[in-house]
Interface confidence: low
Amino acid sequence: SQVSNLLKQQQTNLTHQKNKLEGQISARQQAEEASQESQNELKEMIETLAWKLNEKSKEQMELHHQNLNLQETLKRVANCSAPCPQDWIWHEENCYLFSTGSFNWEKSQEKCLSLDAKLLKINSTADLDFIQQAISYSSFPFWMGLSRRNPSYPWLWEDGSPLMPHLFRIRGAVSQTYPSGTCAYIQRGAVYAENCILAAFSICQKKANLRAQ
Amino acid sequence: SQVSNLLKQQQTNLTHQKNKLEGQISARQQAEEASQESQNELKEMIETLAWKLNEKSKEQMELHHQNLNLQETLKRVANCSAPCPQDWIWHEENCYLFSTGSFNWEKSQEKCLSLDAKLLKINSTADLDFIQQAISYSSFPFWMGLSRRNPSYPWLWEDGSPLMPHLFRIRGAVSQTYPSGTCAYIQRGAVYAENCILAAFSICQKKANLRAQ
């Protein structure tokens, strides 16, 4: 009976311990479930943030591209809005470039064409005045876009239009015939006829960009 | 004795259950610790992502402002005026005008001032190259904005800054003393010292209008 009592007491203790442990396990299980829930929430939050970050990155990339495009456009527009490119002289409706190299007439013509221009064309006495003034400090000859095949042909500008006789008198080798034709150059304000094969400076001309200034 | 055996058996069962529960608790405790660790990691990740998102938002805001500014500038630049006035040459950040009259240095300086400009200032070898090329077809002298009171004074530009010695060598009357001072001119690519009272062509220079208008 004494043994029996002792065993009963031990059993009561063990049952108590077991119940306590079961309670602990139940509490832990609840905490674990809550923790799992919290972890799932955190994971969801991470997913949302990662998605948002990805979206922001995409938007930023797009803005960056837009920026680059705008900067490009700005560069172009800055150029577009200038009546003439760098190193050219803007006068009235035209841009003029005084070549820094010396070439024959045909090569000079090519150089102007490569710059989206033509050799100098003088349309009026005002044009002539400006050019005479612009080259007043040079003693060298400058090819202009005026030529003729031989003395029996008329003087023609590059666009095919004839020279207006009142504009200027052509001096020099006007009655000479050259295999390469006769071309006109301007020097110290006067216009001369010369063999197109000779090298001289030149003046390129193109329309000034006077839109939306 | 039979009761005793039954109690012993129950006790063994309870001990086994207790041990099992203790094992479960221990496992749960470890899982809980791991879960806590994982949760801390997730929280850290969230913090990092939130910070990154915040930074991206700031960057995006900045880009957005840049974009708006660029669009504004673009609108204004579309209406902006030419970088340089008529008859001037636009090169890099400056406008240049080659005078068509011949005057002494002081008079040349006045002429430039009346055009809201100064006499030529050469800041770099690139500037020098451009000017040398621009006057390559002229044999005439051009005053520049460089002068000194007498040979014991330094060469100064109009804005008071000294000449950088590596740019070019000044030839000619460098050791002469003149009542009007000694001025520098450029001719055929070389720079010479001369009496400021003499007449020569000149080159005016001013900043090109490259600001968004």
Epitope: S102, F201 | S136, S139, P141, R188
Partner: antibody
Framework: QVQLVQSGAEVKKPGASVKVSCKAS????????VHWVRQAPGQGLEWMGA????????AYVQKFQGRVTMTRDTSISTAYMELSRLRSDDTAVYYC????????WGQGTLVTVSS | DIQMTQSPSSVSASVGDRVTITCRAS??????LVWYQQKPGKAPKLLLY???RLESGVPSRFSGSGSGTDYTLTISSLQPEDIATYYC?????????FGQGTKLEIK
């Protein structure tokens, strides 16, 4: 040191052409213009024109326009002056000279035009 | 073209004399004028440029002055080696014209 060495004397018939060379040394050939000056026997100096060796651009006195051609070969630092349709009054010593102002001269080339 | 007129066309002076040669331009040349000395059978030699700048190596007895259209070459004390023909030349505008020359002889 700076030197300009010209080609030797020439005897030509009226109507012919003569080409005088001028080899430069001792300086950067393309930096200075080369000018041509002539001097008829017992006469003064007469400026004929100039060439800019860097670019090849040339300027001639109106009197010689169409008869004179100034060229250069930068690879050998040499300038040339060709005078065509020679007449007896073209008999002269022809000088090449480095300009600004003329500080160095060639030794001169005597061109005699005689039938 | 700018005409350059030298005077006298010839001058005879003694050693030690002061000699003056003048050069007149048909229009103002802003001091862009040079003086050359030429001895028989030789190429000309640069004496002065910019009207009054003495070329290096040229004796200081040579000097130049003038402005506008009128310019002067002065030899302060004539030496035997100065016997030569002297030319002025304008270099303002092409063609760069010369004066006709002044022949200097010893008395």
């Amino acid at each position: 040191q700076v030197q300009l060495v010209q080609s030797g004397a020439e005897v030509k018939k009226p109507g012919a052409s003569v080409k005088v060379s001028c080899k430069a040394s001792g300086y950067t050939f393309t930096d200075y213009e080369v000018h041509w000056v002539r001097q008829a026997p017992g006469q003064g100096l007469e400026w004929m024109g100039a060439i800019h060796p860097g670019s090849g651009g040339a300027a001639y006195v109106q009197k010689f326009q169409g008869r004179v051609t100034m060229t250069r070969d930068t690879s050998i630092s040499t300038a040339y002056m060709e005078l065509s349709r020679l007449r007896s009054d073209d008999t002269a010593v022809y000088y090449c000279a480095r300009w600004l102002p003329i500080d160095y001269w060639g030794q001169g080339t005597l061109v005699t035009v005689s039938s | 073209d700018i005409q350059m007129t030298q005077s006298p066309s010839s001058v005879s002076a003694s050693v030690g004399d002061r000699v003056t040669i003048t050069c007149r331009a048909s229009q103002g040349i802003n001091n862009w004028l040079v003086w050359y000395q030429q001895k028989p059978g030789k190429a000309p030699k640069l004496l002065l440029y910019a009207a009054s700048r003495l070329e290096s190596g040229v004796p200081s007895r040579f000097s130049g002055s003038g402005s506008g259209t009128d310019y002067t070459l002065t030899i302060s004390s004539l030496q035997p080696e100065d016997i030569a023909t002297y030319y002025c030349q304008q270099y303002l505008i092409t063609p760069y014209t010369f004066g006709q020359g002044t022949k200097l002889e010893i008395k």
